[in-house]
């Protein structure tokens, strides 16, 4: 049996940060499980992982250098992403993986979500002119 | 039987602009087919047909507005895409139909391509200073 | 010569069902999608429903999602309309037409049309 | 859905007349716009296709022009086989759907 996930088609990163809501059709209240985040088509850069633990405080890691925070839900986890560039700009699908109780429970493959980094395109200041001669 | 289609992952166009080319395991040579490019998870928007016949010219239009052109090779078509806004940066899927002869034939989905429209994001002029005063 | 030819228009009571042909000649069947469009007396033009025999892939109207039934078969060269639960107001001249499947926007060629008369 | 609105429903002219019928669409279709003509107890014919193209057999008299949401279609010079009613239809998007008619009548 696998759990299925729900994400946002598309989301857009004005000020290069993003809140990715994964939604699941399980209950991971008194679960230990590992909820993740992959970046690009083939899911090749796992973006950051939150651990959750029935007995202990929520963990949340990139081993990917992504500056990265999450948020429980009963049936969801958000992935709170900043610092983002615009070369980022990617497919991100969730993932989740029930450890225990047993048996071991995954999500079927998601559609993704497209992040789209417009970030903040600065232009540089005009040189100061100083002050004009008489 | 479905056909197979390739595409590369994420293409970037700098200058709004970008070719994207679907591969295919099957041969167009001498078949009346209709190739297609899907803009969003869902392909909701058809971007570009590609009407294909042995006894007429390759016919290329888009009914949503985009501005495309169509390349054919033996197994592949490319999509030359121009004006694209940066907003339209998505997931693009292509899909492959033949008419002619029977069987009717299509593709399998593919992963899609990421096209990032980076656009180009012009700094005003910093105002001519004019001559300096002796 | 490329020739559409309806045939199963009748008179029927509200409720009851009929079922419409609509047969192709002259020209590669998958090539192209049929389509049925209505005409109610004195009035305009209402697409009904579409196939493309291909893949079997079909759309309809809402005015008849659910009671009405598009199919082709492709040995026969001929497209179907299955009508059920008809009412009052689906009361028309029923015409067959075909618009290509590689270059879809326009109806070129089109059927003599038969009638349907839903009355008590 | 989008809605197409004909004007006028319904106009009368002389053979020899320069007629136009107009077709607003709800929202923009590019040039995704045909035109046909029927005559009583008869199917629709196909005069113009993608807003400005003629069917092939259709008189030159006859010419379409427009883009976007705003459409026209022109019969030079009205001859006796042209009193008939003209329908317009939107190609862009499912469900296709036709304008309500213009009827030319003889004055």
């Known amino acids: 049996n696998k759990i299925l996930v729900k994400q946002s088609p598309m989301l857009v990163a004005y000020d290069n940060a993003v809140n990715l809501s994964c939604k699941y059709s399980y209950n991971l209240f008194s679960r230990e499980f590992r909820a993740s985040l992959h970046k690009g088509l083939d899911s090749a850069v796992e973006v950051c992982v939150v651990y959750g633990n029935y007995s202990q405080q929520l963990q949340v890691y990139s081993k990917t250098g992504f500056n990265c925070d999450g948020k429980l839900g009963n049936e969801s986890v958000t992935f709170y992403l900043q610092n983002l560039y615009v070369n980022q700009t990617d497919i991100y699908f969730c993932k989740i993986e029930v450890m225990y109780p047993p048996p071991y429970l995954d999500n079927e493959k998601s559609n993704g979500t497209i992040i789209h980094v417009k970030g903040k395109h600065l232009c540089p200041s005009p040189l100061f002119p100083g002050p004009s001669k008489p | 039987n479905k056909i197979l289609v390739k595409q590369s992952p994420m293409l970037v166009a700098y200058d709004n602009a970008v070719n994207l080319s679907c591969k295919y395991s099957y041969n167009l040579f001498s078949r009346e087919f209709r190739a297609s490019l899907h803009k969003g998870l869902d392909s909701a928007v058809e971007v570009c047909v590609v009407y294909g016949n042995y006894s007429q010219q390759l016919q290329v239009y888009s009914k949503t507005g985009f501005n495309c052109d169509g390349k054919l090779g033996n197994e592949s078509v490319t999509f030359y895409l121009q004006n694209l806004y940066v907003n339209q940066t998505d997931i693009y899927f292509c899909k492959i139909e033949v008419m002619y002869p029977p069987p009717y034939l299509d593709n399998e989905k593919s992963n899609g391509t990421i096209i990032h429209v980076k656009g180009k994001h012009l700094c005003p002029s910093p105002l001519f200073p004019g001559p300096s005063k002796p | 010569e490329v020739q559409l030819v309806e045939s199963g228009g009748g008179l029927v009571q509200p409720g009851g069902s009929l079922r419409l042909s609509c047969a192709a000649s002259g020209f590669t069947f998958t090539s192209y999608y049929i389509h049925w469009v209505r005409q109610a007396p004195g009035k305009g033009l209402e697409w009904v429903a579409s196939i493309y025999p291909g893949n079997v892939a079909t759309r309809y109207a809402d005015s008849v999602k659910g009671r009405f039934t598009i199919s082709a078969d492709t040995s026969k060269n001929t497209a179907y309309l299955q009508m059920n639960s008809l009412r009052a107001e689906d009361t028309a001249v029923y015409y067959c037409t075909r618009s290509h499947y590689g270059l879809d926007w326009n109806f070129d060629v089109w059927g003599q049309g038969t009638t349907v008369t839903v009355s008590s | 859905d989008i809605q197409m609105t004909q004007s006028p429903s319904s106009l009368s002219a002389s053979v020899g007349d320069r007629v136009t019928i107009t077709c607003h669409a709800s929202q923009n279709i590019y040039v995704w716009l045909n035109w046909y003509q029927q005559k009583p107890g008869k199917a629709p014919k196909l005069l113009i296709y993608?807003?400005?193209n003629l069917h092939t057999g259709v008189p030159s008299r006859f010419s379409g022009s427009g883009s976007g949401t705003d459409f026209t279609l022109t019969i030079s010079s009205l001859q006796p086989e042209d009193f008939a009613t003209y329908y317009c239809q939107q190609g862009q998007t499912y469900p296709y759907t036709f304008g309500g008619g213009t009827k030319v009548e003889i004055k």
């Open positions: 993608k807003a400005s």
